[in-house]
């Protein structure tokens, strides 16, 4: 029987900069029941606080609700693991909420085949940013990525769309049914999950482009 091993806070995420959650990985338990507590202070403070909510984020987590979340100040936190034989502490972790945002997927993905008379046909898609993200303030720059594949294909083809919320793809296989998805990330955050797949049937008379390229 030994004191617990050193825990590690390995992940912090925020859906929208208004709340966030951090998760830790326990070290070895030393063969005894172990209690974990997360303590933190914000930059400019010396007063330590205990995690306000150990429940919402699931096991080995600390959730910071709206009243505990500030974008203006860096959080300095550590986890203490204690059993009957002693304690161990994680390394200190510094968290700036701006840099842990993982948004919800983009919304309202619509996909259409466009066949203008004077030009080659193309696949046109548009979407909306996730509702929780306030882009008007300028705090967020959302970047988008699209992936698509014929229904029975194994490999996805991905396209980086930058900050655009619409996109054209010129090279597709006629007669195929395609799955299309989109995801987003803030410049220094994390990719969202992929949006639910949208299906589009490419007409059999769709003229394949000579060169595989796309336009924003």
């Amino acid at each position: 029987q030994l004191p617990p091993g050193k825990p590690e806070i390995f992940k912090c995420r925020s859906p929208n900069k208004e709340t966030f959650t951090c998760w830790w990985r326990p070290g070895t338990d030393g063969g005894l029941p172990t209690n974990y507590s997360l303590t933190y202070h914000r930059e400019g403070e010396t007063l330590m606080h205990e995690c306000p909510d150990y429940i919402t984020g699931g096991p080995n987590s600390c959730h910071f609700g709206k009243q505990y979340t500030s974008m203006w100040r860096t959080y300095v936190m550590m986890v203490n693991a204690t059993n009957q034989m002693g304690s161990s502490f994680s390394d200190e972790l510094y968290v700036d909420v701006t840099y842990i945002v993982q948004p919800d997927p983009p919304l309202e993905l619509t996909v259409e085949v466009k066949q203008p008379e004077d030009r080659k046909p193309y696949l046109w898609m548009k979407w909306s940013p996730p509702t929780l993200i306030d882009l008007k303030t300028g705090w967020f720059t959302l970047l988008y990525e699209i992936r698509l594949k014929p229904e029975k294909a194994a490999e996805w083809e991905t396209h980086f769309a930058g900050q655009q919320t619409e996109f054209k793809i010129l090279s597709l296989h006629p007669g195929q049914k395609y799955l299309v998805q989109v995801r987003c990330k803030p410049d220094h955050g994390y990719w969202s999950a992929w949006s639910p797949a949208t299906f589009i049937q490419i007409p059999s008379d769709f003229i394949m482009n000579d060169h595989h390229h796309h336009h924003h």
């Epitope: 590690e8 992940k11 974008m71 203006w72 510094y94 968290v95 700036d96 840099y99 300028g138 994390y190």
Partner: antibody, heavy 118, light 112 residues
Amino acid sequence: EVQLVQSGAEVKKPGSSVKVSCKASGYTFTSYWIHWVRQAPGQGLEWIGEIDPSDSYTNYNQKFKGRATLTVDRSSSTAYMELSSLRSEDTAVYYCGRSFFTNWFAYWGQGTLVTVSS
Amino acid sequence: DVVMTQTPLSLSVTPGQPASISCRSSQSLVHSNGNTYLHWYLQKPGQSPQLLIYKVSNRFSGVPDRFSGSGSGTDFTLKISRVEAEDVGVYFCSQSTHVPFTFGGGTKVEIK
């Protein structure tokens, strides 16, 4: 203990490429961005770019875009910085650095001296 | 790119005396999120840089309280209240508000 251990010194010819490695230990490699910074002899520090090891997403200093390539090998917790079309002005100590969930870095590798000389 | 200008270039200080380094940026370092990402690093002879101060005025873990940072907008200062022999090296300011991140040219501090 967090450690970033870089590969050894290199001597390269102008026009060639160099690939510097940075092996991370003591933490979950995919959790934090890795930055690359260089320091020419007797000079200041110059930021090359950064990579998120969780998905290999990169941001580059435009000055190095097209010449620097940042990659990671998650299986060995190693980050790489490759610089191509080397010239004498690229002679410098190259450092990797690790951020927290922040945009500043608190841990640095020991540095790798790259000398470009004909 | 944001240009970071440090003064003085070098500083010779008597142990126990104060020292002050100035850093000026070519544009405001206030991020759109309201934070100011101005940091100070010390590079001791033959070593890698080490973080002293983050976000203008916050001492990093283990940094002695004789180091303090202040400033706002484009003008920033690092102060050492009482210089010790172990403080010798080159001090760099750095900004991470704007990409690319940039560094000052450095201030070399030596002991008289």
